[in-house]
Amino acid sequence: GMEVRWCATSDPEQHKCGNMSEAFREAGIQPSLLCVRGTSADHCVQLIAAQEADAITLDGGAIYEAGKEHGLKPVVGEVYDQEVGTSYYAVAVVRRSSHVTIDTLKGVKSCHTGINRTVGWNVPVGYLVESGRLSVMGCDVLKAVSDYFGGSCVPGAGETSYSESLCRLCRGDSSGEGVCDKSPLERYYDYSGAFRCLAEGAGDVAFVKHSTVLENTDGKTLPSWGQALLSQDFELLCRDGSRADVTEWRQCHLARVPAHAVVVRADTDGGLIFRLLNEGQRLFSHEGSSFQMFSSEAYGQKDLLFKDSTSELVPIATQTYEAWLGHEYLHAMKGLLCDPNRLPPYLRWCVLSTPEIQKCGDMAVAFRRQRLKPEIQCVSAKSPQHCMERIQAEQVDAVTLSGEDIYTAGKTYGLVPAAGEHYAPEDSSNSYYVVAVVRRDSSHAFTLDELRGKRSCHAGFGSPAGWDVPVGALIQRGFIRPKDCDVLTAVSEFFNASCVPVNNPKNYPSSLCALCVGDEQGRNKCVGNSQERYYGYRGAFRCLVENAGDVAFVRHTTVFDNTNGHNSEPWAAELRSEDYELLCPNGARAEVSQFAACNLAQIPPHAVMVRPDTNIFTVYGLLDKAQDLFGDDHNKNGFKMFDSSNYHGQDLLFKDATVRAVPVGEKTTYRGWLGLDYVAALEGMSSQQC
């Protein structure tokens, strides 16, 4: 008949499993339960995947690994206390009197329940990495954490290479024994110990459970250290940078931590497993029963097969590891799970020209000299598209791409952003907003939804802010509907008249040149260069200013560059920026200074793109450590990451305007990095490429 083979990870667990099997058999519970001995949770997962065992209870981190690497699914969950159900919450606690926030944890003293523990280590460290606050080079999480905090107590870190920093705040027992032990010998061990570390002023932040503060304050704790503590003297750090009362843990936490769950192979019937265990818990979970499913006391251990604090087992409806873990915990695990043994020794960078090969070679040497990991290798390709193909084919690992190329890399080749460039505000030519500018006119005001029949001014055919984005956006929003992919005709029919300067006017609709004026002599009308006075962003704005058009599609800087005395040409000399407004996608109008909130799209910064199976945190970790050494254009370390002048080129490997590489944070897909408006505009245009 059918049998379920439970995997036990130790002798005591094997003992308890044997007793459970016997108890179930005597009670006539079907299918029969057998026990298989594994050496660890990891080993058991491998046995289950290999069909040599069927089930095991795992914690969140192990469920993530089992699901991601071996395709196992959670089918039965543990419940601990009725208030929170099948989860608890990992929180960061600080003294109310301090000024610490989630964004200022660098350099503060930290208290942890123990090394590799869920709320004390895995969640906070994973969250800090995943959110881009903590960069990790070469998977060396311990080093990254020891460099990040200004001293810590992480019980159990004494055996690591970074014990000086990670055990600095630990104090051992009253006689100084057991310093940094992962046991009650260390006074700052476990939930209450980590909180005590904060309460006694040793640390500035404690990573604990949602209930820890309330269980150890307001007279609820017996030990003398907690007698006088008041819960109101502590606050929680929220992910958005704010702080909250300790009772607000449902809204203000680092992650909801899923309960332990029973996992099985994808082809195993989860309902069957639950029926088996449900019969068992009905008979063997209350005091006085011959076998205790949720107690490990008889075996001299804790949490054997199930957590001792389990009050009941429940079926899991959506049997995927992602759904069970939840996005907060899932994200934290992504940041944490980096196996140095599985880290590729090289990061192969895609290069597109001889100068870029030279700069990449120098970068590889400079990084190696500083022992940065992984090492850089340089691999040539013929074009950005060729890079994408080679990355997808696993012949190369990374390349820096522009907005349109990021779109192609993501949509066609499945690549994802691993790091981004950030430019100084003065460098508006590298990343800018596309805006629709109109005259401030209360009597004839119209919105973005009412552009049909208006007169339009464009920098030129094919210009990003003057044509591609606005036309793409209007197509995507359904206002312009090209027939047979004829965008030009559709635009010419949508607007009453336009000026869209062009280099090759063959078969060009006349209405797209109707507003153009040419040069001072009236020649060169509608040409795609500065002989046409309405050419370019300045010209498109002039077209609006001189009342030729009703709307100008330009960059967010254009109005400022040509008003308030910033342009002394006669047509612009007396213009005031307050006489113009922006049309917003939501139908409103806004001041020209509100471009960040009221625009058609932002032309995004360049990003480093990689395969989705590449660990993006190791890529950013490498670039972040590298930019500390080589990011400043005046550094004396022998290489300049963001400068190409030594190679007689421009924008090699990275744009020269880059002031720093940034983590992608939540923008982990090409759509996230590019922004929905920019993607929509590109899709609007690409939908017309027949």
Epitope: P425, E426, D427, S428, F560, S593, V659
Partner: antibody, heavy 119, light 112 residues
Framework: QVQLQESGPGLVKPSETLSLTCTVS????????WNWIRQPPGKGLEYIGY???????YYNPSLKSRVTISRDTSKNQYSLKLSSVTAADTAVYYC?????????????WGQGTLVTVSS | DFVMTQSPLSLPVTLGQPASISCRAS???????????LHWYQQRPGQSPRLLIY???NRFSGVPDRFSGSGSGTDFTLKISRVEAEDVGVYYC?????????FGQGTKLEIK
């Protein structure tokens, strides 16, 4: 009218962390760039860094390893932390705004707060 | 690093007379967008700096028209057509074309 106001302790011990907050009124810190500058007694101005409208930070490389700038948009405040201070960090610390309207010149400044590093 | 050099460092001026301060950058301040991000600040005694001129020659709101700025590339000048008593203080040029933004060492204007 845009106003910026620095606040924080006037005395910090060597090796400790200097913490200052800039409270902004008359504008939102979710637009523009929000900066810290310092001026040692009797000396010139030194740029420390900024936090952008989207929350991205940039730090002067000479101070980068010790600086953190963060913000609390709900309070319209941004903060400076400078760790491991020495007597050389004694200065008047200013917060200031930069926007496109003045081509990212620092158009509005706080009144400054003197921070002395001494044991 | 990127250096801004002002001269003179001290400038005694008679009330009602003109004054001129020079500022030289160690590299061109013309940005790729064509703009020159060179600004001038005034710091009166005991006060915080105040923006006078931005982008070489644009007066900030509320700044008297006796102040003017000029220059291009690497050489820039701040002129005061007729010095008044309230103009006493230190004047700084500053660039933000290159990161980090840097300041000149300051020119102290005093009344003769």
């Amino acid at each position: 009218q845009v106003q910026l106001q620095e606040s924080g302790p006037g005395l910090v011990k060597p090796s400790e962390t200097l913490s200052l907050t800039c409270t902004v009124s008359g504008d939102s810190i979710t637009s523009g760039y929000w900066n810290w500058i310092r001026q040692p007694p009797g000396k010139g101005l030194e740029y420390i860094g900024y936090i952008s409208d989207s929350g991205i930070t940039y730090y002067n490389p000479s101070l980068k390893s010790r600086v953190t700038i963060s913000r609390d948009t709900s309070k319209n405040q941004y903060s400076l932390k400078l760790s491991s201070v020495t007597a050389a960090d004694t200065a008047v610390y200013y917060c200031a705004r930069r926007t496109l309207a003045t081509y990212y010149a620092m158009d509005y400044w706080g009144q400054g707060t003197l921070v002395t590093v001494s044991s | 690093d990127f250096v801004m050099t002002q001269s003179p460092l001290s400038l005694p001026v008679t009330l009602g007379q003109p004054a001129s301060i020079s500022c030289r950058a160690s590299q061109s301040l013309v940005q790729s967008d064509g703009n020159t991000y060179l600004h001038w600040y005034q710091q009166r005694p005991g006060q915080s700096p105040r923006l006078l001129i931005y982008r070489v020659s644009n007066r900030f709101s509320g700044v008297p028209d006796r102040f003017s700025g000029s220059g291009s590339g690497t050489d820039f000048t701040l002129k005061i057509s007729r010095v008044e008593a309230e103009d006493v203080g230190v004047y700084y040029c500053s660039q933000s074309t290159h990161v980090p933004p840097t300041f000149g060492q300051g020119t102290k204007l005093e009344i003769k």
